[in-house]
């Protein structure tokens, strides 16, 4: 867990868990079905997914100056994706296989977000899009797109934690 009241997370733990997330996100992705995306437009559920951008302080200099900006952004994204993975997009039909990595992925997102949440401090979480129940036929594409954007997100987060573990750990 983050150091109580402090500004530094347990970088090494976060690095390990973010690497696990990367592995899970890649292993889950092909299991949601091979999709032909040529005729598919963007879906509103995946339009507003969090991205880590230049102004988020996740570059080496930003992390040195004040890592909290970047960590808050990562935390928001983790919560966002954790909610999406618990929505009926993933829990409804068509059913995921019992041994699907999506369950582990969901738990690991929650685990990393808890590591980042300092004791007694609650960051504002980004608004989750209000998800009206999706139709089963839409879910295959939505899962594909959500996992694809999650892969990109956790890849950046893993690089941040790797840098933090190497240069910012006490």
């Amino acid at each position: 867990r983050a150091v109580p009241g402090g500004s530094s997370p347990a970088w090494t733990q976060c690095q390990q868990l973010s690497q696990k997330l990367c592995t899970l996100a890649w292993s889950a992705h092909p299991l949601v079905g091979h999709m032909d995306l040529r005729e598919e437009g963007d879906e509103e559920t995946t339009n507003d997914v969090p991205h880590i951008q230049c102004g988020d302080g996740c570059d080496p200099q930003g992390l040195r100056d004040n890592s909290q900006f970047c960590l808050q952004r990562i935390h928001q994204g983790l919560i966002f994706y954790e909610k999406l993975l618990g929505s009926d997009i993933f829990t409804g039909e068509p059913s995921l296989l019992p041994d699907s990595p999506v369950g582990q992925l969901h738990a690991s997102l929650l685990g990393l977000s808890q590591l980042l949440q300092p004791e007694g401090h609650h960051w504002e979480t980004q608004q989750i899009p209000s998800l009206s129940p999706s139709q089963p036929w839409q879910r295959l594409l939505l899962r594909f797109k959500i996992l694809r954007s999650l892969q990109a997100f956790v890849a950046v987060a893993a690089r941040v934690f790797a840098h933090g573990a190497a240069t910012l750990s006490p």
Partner: antibody, heavy 115, light 113 residues
Framework: QVQLVQSGAEVKKPGASVKVSCKAS????????MHWVRQAPGQGLEWMGY????????NYNEKFKGRVTMTTDTSTSTAYMELRSLRSDDTAVYYC????????WGQGTLVTVSS | DIVMTQSPDSLAVSLGERATINCKSS????????????LAWYQQKPGQPPKLLIY???TRESGVPDRFSGSGSGTDFTLTISSLQAEDVAVYYC?????????FGQGTKVEIK
């Protein structure tokens, strides 16, 4: 193994409410939606709606909106279906069922509405 | 809502003979991006909940005997019992899970001739 165990038969008067429970075991309760389906005597199957135990999100068949409420208690892995303003044509066996394409159903609960 | 229509309503077949049940949907159940049909077949015996036989129109549920097979695509589907056994006497339902509300066919009663 996955099991869905429902509460016992009920006899209700017209205008009353009934609440049927469905206790799940053998899987992670919050990982799958729970559907409710009913079957009137000698009739076919009718989908009533579902609840997502993870976030309590519901999706009801328009036919039952305003009369049905689906809830869950994640601490006991139990789903509930309450039907209000009962009429005689609500007499049916009510089933809970986990995602259709994996085929797990409760044993059914007979609800008889009679004056 | 998608309307599911089964035929025939009832069917009497000799033991060991083939039984064929048809199911027609009012709109296509085929999702073109992965070429899957969102259709399931159930078997229901008196006093029991329905039992899943087939999903994705043609994928047999584990433990279901291989005499049961599903075929078809789009709006027209078929459940075939290649060699009817005494324990197959039941009502059979098709069901679409392409969109809400999920809907079922009216059922086909299979008996022994």
């Amino acid at each position: 193994q996955v099991q869905l165990v429902q509460s016992g038969a009920e006899v209700k008067k017209p205008g009353a409410s009934v609440k049927v429970s469905c206790k799940a075991s053998g899987y992670t309760f919050t990982s799958y939606v729970m559907h409710w389906v009913r079957q009137a005597p000698g009739q076919g199957l009718e989908w009533m709606g579902y609840i997502n135990p993870y976030n309590a999100g519901t999706n009801y068949n328009e036919k039952f909106k305003g009369r049905v409420t689906m809830t869950t208690d994640t601490s006991t892995s139990t789903a509930y279906m309450e039907l209000r303003s009962l009429r005689s044509d609500d007499t049916a066996v009510y089933y809970c069922a986990r995602n259709w394409d994996v085929g797990y159903w409760g044993q059914g609960t007979l609800v008889t509405v009679s004056s | 809502d998608i309307v599911m229509t089964q035929s025939p309503d009832s069917l009497a077949v000799s033991l060991g003979e083939r039984a064929t049940i048809n199911c027609k949907s009012s709109q296509s159940l085929l999702y073109s991006s992965n070429q899957k049909n969102f259709l399931a077949w159930y078997q229901q015996k008196p006093g029991q909940p329905p039992k899943l036989l087939i999903y994705w129109a043609s994928t047999r549920e584990s433990g279901v005997p291989d005499r049961f097979s599903g075929s078809g695509s789009g709006t027209d589907f078929t459940l075939t019992i290649s060699s009817l056994q005494a324990e197959d006497v039941a009502v059979y339902y098709c069901q679409q899970y392409y969109s809400y509300p999920f809907t079922f066919g009216q059922g086909t009663k299979v008996e022994i001739k």
